[in-house]
Amino acid sequence: ASVATELRCQCLQTLQGIHPKNIQSVNVKSPGPHCAQTEVIATLKNGRKACLNPASPIVKKIIEKMLNSDKSN
């Protein structure tokens, strides 16, 4: 989808301490022209999204688990 808007880093602030069971899915955005850092955007089960810290060990575990469950589906 083409978007007529200048995109930039989306994660101005990362959410700490969200329980993995409150996360429905994660979208990992690789660095690119719009943003020099990796961004992890989680879709929560309650109709909100939140940025997670990609360097956090628990976030790495969540991403790994979700990527593995995607592969097995």
Partner: antibody, heavy 116, light 111 residues
Framework: ELQLQQSGAELVKPGASVKLSCTAS????????IHWVKQRPEQGLEWIGR????????KYDPKFQGKATITADTSSNTAYLQLSSLTSEDTAVYYC?????????WGQGTLVTVSA | NIVLTQSPASLAVSLGQRATISCRAS??????????MHWYQQKPGQPPKLLIY???NLESGVPVRFSGSGSRTDFTLTIDPVEADDAATYYC?????????FGSGTKLEIK
């Protein structure tokens, strides 16, 4: 600047329908949820519903089911709220809100006035 | 639907003093230790502004004079010290369960 721009005020007749728009700039609506909130004059806030533009999934407060329809067009980075069978009870300011924690943006609001 | 009861409906606080607003939910808004309760500020003619999310997290750019606390059914928004610019209506909102619901609002007047 990251923002949500809503369409202009509407004066509509009872029984008619109206479609309000909410266009995002500076971010992609597929990365968020768009929520719609109603505020009648001098009253509190009422949550109408939300859409996940990435897949089109919607959720409504049952009291707005049949009254409100939320859609999104990712190519124009815009979400819409359609209100049908309008009555004086629908006279209100309607806000769109971008559903992320840590960066919550609201549109400026659209006033809908229902009058014969 | 989860009903949110805010108290008081209005309060007047002297400049520099502490303002405390309460929000009680008809059932728990916690899920796996996260409290899905948020606080908004609204001034006349303006859209609401998110101040606190997930009970105690300060939204980006919000002064540290604002703080939130609580869990399960009882939540508090504290403004300390109050400044003239804080005159507004404050709403709590839960989104642990659909449909999302708002409290009826607390109007803060600065003396």
């Amino acid at each position: 600047e990251l923002q949500l721009q809503q369409s202009g005020a509407e004066l509509v007749k009872p029984g008619a329908s109206v479609k309000l728009s909410c266009t995002a700039s500076g971010f992609n609506i597929e990365d968020t949820f768009i929520h719609w909130v109603k505020q009648r004059p001098e009253q509190g806030l009422e949550w109408i519903g939300r859409i996940d533009p990435a897949n089109g999934n919607t959720k409504y407060d049952p009291k707005f089911q049949g009254k409100a329809t939320i859609t999104a067009d990712t190519s124009s980075n815009t979400a819409y709220l359609q209100l049908s069978s309008l009555t004086s009870e629908d006279t209100a300011v309607y806000y769109c809100e971008e559903g992320r924690y840590g960066v919550a943006y609201w549109g400026q609001g659209t006033l809908v006035t229902v009058s014969a | 639907n989860i009903v949110l009861t805010q108290s008081p409906a209005s309060l007047a606080v002297s400049l520099g003093q502490r303002a405390t607003i309460s929000c009680r939910a008809s059932e728990s808004v916690d899920s796996y230790g996260n409290s899905f309760m948020h606080w908004y500020q609204q001034k006349p003619g303006q859209p609401p502004k998110l101040l606190i999310y997930l009970a105690s997290n300060l939204e980006s750019g919000v002064p540290v004079r604002f703080s939130g606390s609580g869990s399960r059914t009882d939540f508090t928004l504290t403004i300390d010290p109050v400044e003239a610019d804080d005159a507004a209506t404050y709403y709590c909102q839960q989104n642990n369960e659909d449909p999302f619901t708002f409290g009826s609002g607390t109007k803060l007047e600065i003396k």
